[in-house]
Interface confidence: medium
């Protein structure tokens, strides 16, 4: 069940973690000691499900978190918006060498919506994500931490859907929101011709040819 959040009209949301009511229940590997689902609040006192990890003291971290299956709804290119906080390693005493300030984003295309395990070698890396603003202990004391927003796109996609995965290699992160969406050109009327909602092409610059139809009371 999802609550509605307002986004631009040309964006169609496939996944919005902040709108999910109840647990997200994404798959973490290892099952314990890595990513942990944590309930926090939004400004309206509504619970938000987040994922957090902070194993900055231990070396050789390899913690994976995988979303549920996401249908692509015919989109060839999708966008992933991640909002997160990330702790500044310099503000953590005694963690030099083990603490990181990045995490990795992956995807895996699949027609199977019920894959139960994370098979790391199936996933394709999208990017390494770093924070524009990491926070220090002073920020925690002052009780305000800026949210970083990073958007990545992936495509062309061809299977029915896909999974996203987040790999932590030793950072202190809270994933506050994950939104996956595609873009469309909304219904348009030009010179008495009507063109339907159209999903954008595989590339950001792709032109998509669409057949229009005459508006009511007009003819070709």
């Amino acid at each position: 069940v999802t609550g509605s959040r307002v986004y631009p009209a040309n964006e169609v949301t496939l996944l919005d973690s902040r709108s999910v009511q109840g647990e997200l229940g994404w798959i973490a590997s290892p099952l314990e000691g890595g990513w942990e689902e944590v309930s926090i609040m939004d400004e309206k006192n509504t619970p938000i499900r987040t994922y957090q990890v902070c194993n900055v003291m231990e070396p050789s971290q390899n913690n994976w978190l995988r979303t549920d299956w996401i249908t692509r709804e015919g989109a060839q290119r999708v966008y992933i918006e991640i909002k997160f906080t990330l702790r500044d390693c310099n503000s953590l005493p005694g963690v030099m060498g083990t603490c990181k300030e990045t995490f990795n984003l992956y995807y895996y295309e699949s027609d199977n919506d019920k894959e139960r395990f994370i098979r790391e070698n199936q996933f394709v890396k999208i990017d390494t994500i770093a924070a524009d603003e990491s926070f220090t202990q002073v920020d925690i004391g002052d009780r305000i931490m800026k949210l970083n927003t990073e958007i990545r796109d992936v495509g062309p996609l061809s299977k029915k859907g896909f999974y996203l995965a987040f790999q932590d290699v030793g950072a202190c992160i809270a994933l506050v929101s994950v939104r996956v969406f595609y873009k469309k050109c909304p219904l348009t009327v030009r010179n008495l011709a009507q063109f339907p909602d159209t999903i954008t092409g595989a590339d950001t610059s792709s032109l998509v040819e669409v057949r229009g139809s005459c508006v009511n009371n007009s003819e070709e």
Partner: antibody, heavy 126, light 112 residues
Framework: QVQLQQSGAEVKKPGSSVKVSCKAS????????MHWVRQAPGQGLEWMGG????????NYAQKFQGRVTITADKSTSTAYMELSSLRSEDTAVYYC???????????????????WGQGTLVTVSS | DVVMTQSPLSLPVTPGEPASISCRSS???????????LDWYLQKPGQSPQLLIY???NRASGVPDRFSGSGSGTDFTLKISRVEAEDVGVYYC?????????FGQGTRLEIK
């Protein structure tokens, strides 16, 4: 529902240390800030410091820096406050209190102290 | 440190009458995100404090709507529209914009 269960009353000698525990239940321990606040007999409230378990190190009031240590054990959902070099002026009721992390679309902040423990009376007397 | 000053320190009120407590901070508690980092707490006799109002004007869960918070920057007010016998106790304002977090001296509300 959220509950914070604190350890029992303590009587300590000047110069010694005391360690007060606060066991949390009913919420995800790692996602909330855990504060410690004390109240001397007949006096007001005084903030000592706090910690977000997921983010590790604690933050202390300058007044207590070097004497207080706040820690959190994620495995048992328990926070601890240890105060050393005790003096008679440290006689007080010590409270733990939690504040949830709240996130808007641009920032996360830590809200007011939603839940409080029942308090632990620490008496420092020779 | 941010100094919090409450007035009055003692407030005798007749049940059913309104009550108002003022809290002034030595520097602005308005953050650039638009929130005032000012909370109000009530400590009933023999009990732990409880949160009434957070971020200046938001009522905490389960708090009766006769309690309201207002103000911005350095001047804040807690109002009780109709005082009831169960409202007796000490009211504290608290700034949470920066550490150390600091409290007002407290206002003791008593029934006339």
């Amino acid at each position: 529902q959220v509950q914070l269960q604190q350890s029992g009353a303590e009587v300590k000698k000047p110069g010694s240390s005391v360690k007060v525990s606060c066991k949390a239940s009913g919420y995800t321990f790692t996602g909330y800030y855990m504060h410690w606040v004390r109240q001397a007999p007949g006096q007001g409230l005084e903030w000592m410091g706090g910690i977000i378990p997921i983010f590790g190190t604690a933050n202390y009031a300058q007044k207590f820096q070097g004497r207080v240590t706040i820690t959190a054990d994620k495995s048992t959902s328990t926070a601890y406050m240890e105060l050393s070099s005790l003096r008679s002026e440290d006689t007080a009721v010590y409270y733990c209190a939690t504040a949830p992390m709240v996130c808007s679309s641009t920032s996360c902040y830590l809200r007011g102290f939603d839940y409080w423990g029942q308090g632990t009376l620490v008496t420092v007397s020779s | 440190d941010v100094v919090m000053t409450q007035s009055p320190l003692s407030l005798p009120v007749t049940p059913g009458e309104p009550a108002s407590i003022s809290c002034r901070s030595s520097q602005s508690l308005l953050h650039s995100n638009g929130y005032n980092y000012l909370d109000w707490y009530l400590q009933k006799p023999g009990q732990s404090p409880q949160l009434l109002i957070y971020l200046g004007s938001n009522r905490a869960s389960g708090v009766p709507d006769r309690f309201s918070g207002s103000g911005s920057g350095t001047d804040f007010t807690l109002k009780i529209s109709r005082v009831e016998a169960e409202d007796v106790g000490v009211y504290y304002c608290m700034q949470a914009l920066q550490t150390p977090i600091t409290f007002g001296q407290g206002t003791r509300l008593e029934i006339k």
